[in-house]
């Protein structure tokens, strides 16, 4: 008789794939004719770019009225004009349901400002970002996110009354804290008294870049935080090229995508949008590359190969790998809620197993240094569950030259310098 | 609901200079561009140039460059039209049209008109 | 500046027929082709937009498919009310933003 199946987990829709953050409104529509429209209707038009990349929601913002720390003159019920109308973000709202994506409202209140929650006046705003939840909860939004928590006196205790907001609203609705901390206690603590937080934080962005340290600081966070659902991010707000060299954009992507948890990026993490390769552009909000004529101030600066226009064009781009990986995540079970694995892979190399009941299996093998690599797995480490084969099919590589579909002979694996590659094998029973 | 309405129709001399206004209503008006487009009697469409009600950055067609001039009045929610030079060729029933942005999977904005004025016909003859 | 070439110029048909529209870029548009409909004395009036997305209002029976070059516009079964003229417009590269010289659908 065939094994009972596994019954599947009840699944949100920020279980499904990415969150894309999109922080600077203005800084993402760009020029050219992007600049047509006020920044929120000129997002309405990128819908169809985004639906291309597969995130399953939008982080938007803050779009409120904010005087520099001047908690008087900051409403956030108020959108800034700067930014579009209310009537606009309501259409927003309609035409990205339309296309199955999800918005998320950033009420980070003093955005503008020094200290994102006005420190001396705790209760007052406190009070503010209830008013707005309940708001903007009925305008329709999705959840909300608020950065900077460890600016917030008492964090733990308003993110739960927030959370009880929100999710009393409705179970489907979302809150994201983030924080620049990338420690664990502090995190933990964060977390564990609010249930269903997706938080945010530097943790991962203090990896070193190398594989025994990624692989020991995602470990120790998963045991850490038990079966709780996670996001994986390098930061609450910024660019992974704030964070990694050119050469490890491709790894870190693959990484994101398919560890257990919520993906999240930041607007041009998908075609490695570098704010340093652009003169005079912020570090935090660089203008977004769609093509050569958004970066007019120095003509010549950005090449075909910069923007989205260019990579779109190219199968072997950032963003065509971006878009793959998005796809496998939001369709493969063992990806979407799999169990994880991971295991010894030899010195520079970090490797796990995705697998959930009988589907398709997942291997992810990771080069995270700068010399060629011959991986020996370690199968032992694994439980019987998820036991590896003699051999697996190659879905993926973040280099090229590799014959994708073609069986590769686990025993005998070898990487490229800063290689990651995604394999398939069956469930065997 | 959304509505473009425009001025009455013009009979201009050569030389002479025209200016047509374009009244919006029922939308926020400075969340969108206007574009012009004219139709010369019995021919096809022929588009003019854009303006952006959000910050007024304008964008002429080649052929009009110098002579024409788009400018808006958000505390009227109006976008004008002004053609200098006139010739008799520039004879033409003139539209406004709301711009609506989209994109594809490449990133690239398209522009669709989804409200039209009534158009304004302007007549140029000595 | 794209190139957009409409054929044919003109067409008669009946009420009931099914009517296919070509237009053809002078080079590769994407999916960026928008068409409208115009009766005499009247504004164009949008119909599809991104090559084949029906806009609100618009009954079903017009669809648009196409992309790169070639596009067309089909009318399913003619109504009485669909005599008029066409126009297919790109805004790939804008700008300019360019129209087809137009289509003019007449009774047979």
């Known amino acids: 008789r065939a094994p009972r199946c596994r019954e599947l987990p009840a699944q949100k829709w920020w279980h499904t794939g990415a969150l894309y953050r999109i922080g600077d409104l203005q800084a993402f529509q760009g020029h050219g004719a992007g600049n047509l429209a006020a920044p929120i209707s000129g997002l309405k038009g990128r819908l169809d770019y985004l639906s291309s990349l597969k995130v399953k929601g939008l982080v938007l913002g803050p779009i409120h009225k904010n005087q520099k720390d001047d908690v008087a003159q900051t409403d956030l019920l108020q959108i800034d004009p700067n930014f579009g109308s209310k009537e606009d973000f309501d259409s927003l709202l309609q035409s990205a349901k339309k296309k199955s994506i999800r918005v998320i409202l950033d009420l980070t209140p003093n955005y503008r400002g020094e200290n994102s929650w006005f420190s001396t006046q705790v209760d007052t705003v406190a009070t503010k970002v209830k008013d707005a939840l309940e708001f903007w909860l009925q305008a329709g939004v999705d959840g909300f996110q608020v950065r900077d928590i460890e600016n917030l006196k008492d964090a733990s205790s308003f993110l739960a009354e927030w959370q009880n907001i929100t999710k009393g609203f409705s179970e489907d609705r979302l809150l994201i804290a983030g924080t620049n901390s990338s420690d664990l206690q502090q995190i933990l603590s964060l977390l564990e008294s609010n249930k269903d937080l997706l938080l945010t934080s530097s943790y991962l962005s203090d990896s070193g870049s190398t594989g025994e340290h990624t692989k020991s600081l995602v470990t120790q966070y998963l045991n850490a935080t038990g079966n709780r659902w996670c996001s994986w991010s390098l930061s609450q707000a910024r660019l992974l090229t704030s964070f990694l060299p050119a050469q490890l954009l491709r790894l870190y992507q693959l990484m994101l995508f398919t560890l257990p948890g919520t993906p999240v990026f930041s607007y041009g993490d998908e075609i490695g949008l570098d704010a340093a390769a652009l003169p005079g552009q912020p570090m935090e909000a660089p203008v977004m590359l769609w093509d050569e004529s958004s970066f007019p101030d120095i003509p010549g600066a950005v090449s075909a190969n910069m923007t989205v226009k260019g990579q779109s064009e190219d199968p072997g781009s950032l963003l065509s790998l971006f878009r793959r990986l998005s796809d496998q995540r939001s369709k493969e079970r063992s990806l979407l809620h799999g169990d994880f694995h991971a295991f010894s892979a030899g010195p520079g190399l970090f490797s796990y197993i995705r697998h959930w009941d009988q589907n398709e299996r997942f291997l992810v093998v990771l080069n995270f240094g700068d010399v060629g690599l011959s991986a020996g797995l370690q199968a032992s480490d694994l439980p019987a569950s998820a036991s590896l084969p003699a051999k697996a099919d190659l879905l993926l590589s973040t280099q090229p030259g590799r014959e994708e579909g073609s069986p590769l002979e686990l025993e005998r694996l070898k990487l490229e310098p800063h290689e990651g590659l995604l394999l398939r094998f069956p469930y065997a029973a | 609901q959304v509505q473009l309405v425009q001025s009455g129709a013009e009979v201009k001399k050569p030389g002479a200079s025209v200016k047509v206004s374009c009244k919006a209503s029922?939308?926020?008006?400075?969340?969108?561009?206007i574009s012009w487009v004219r139709q010369a009697p019995g021919q096809g469409l022929e588009w003019m140039g854009w303006i952006s009600a959000y910050n007024g950055n304008t964008n002429y067609a080649q052929k009009l460059q110098g002579r024409v001039t788009m400018t808006t009045d958000t505390s009227t929610t109006t976008a004008y039209m002004e053609l200098r030079s006139l010739r008799s060729d520039d004879t033409a029933v003139y539209y406004c049209?709301?711009?609506?942005?989209?994109?594809?999977?490449?990133?690239?904005?398209?522009?669709?008109?989804?409200?039209w004025g009534q158009g304004t016909l302007v007549t140029v003859s000595s | 500046d794209i190139q957009m070439t409409q054929s044919p110029s003109s067409l008669s048909a009946s009420v009931g027929d099914r009517v296919t529209i070509t237009c053809r870029a002078s080079q590769s548009i994407s999916s960026y082709l928008n068409w409208y409909q115009q009766k005499p004395g009247k504004a164009p009036k949008l119909l599809i937009y991104a090559a084949s997305s029906l806009q609100s209002g618009v009954p079903s029976r017009f669809s648009g498919s196409g992309s790169g070059t070639d596009f067309t516009l089909t009318i399913s079964s003619l109504q009485p009310e669909d005599f008029a003229t066409y126009y297919c417009q790109q805004s790939y590269s804008t700008p300019p933003i360019t129209f087809g010289q137009g289509t003019r659908l007449e009774i047979k």
């Open positions: 049209a709301r711009g609506e942005l989209y994109s594809g999977y490449d990133g690239t904005l398209g522009i669709l008109f989804d409200y």
């Open positions: 029922g939308y926020t008006f400075t969340s969108y561009g």
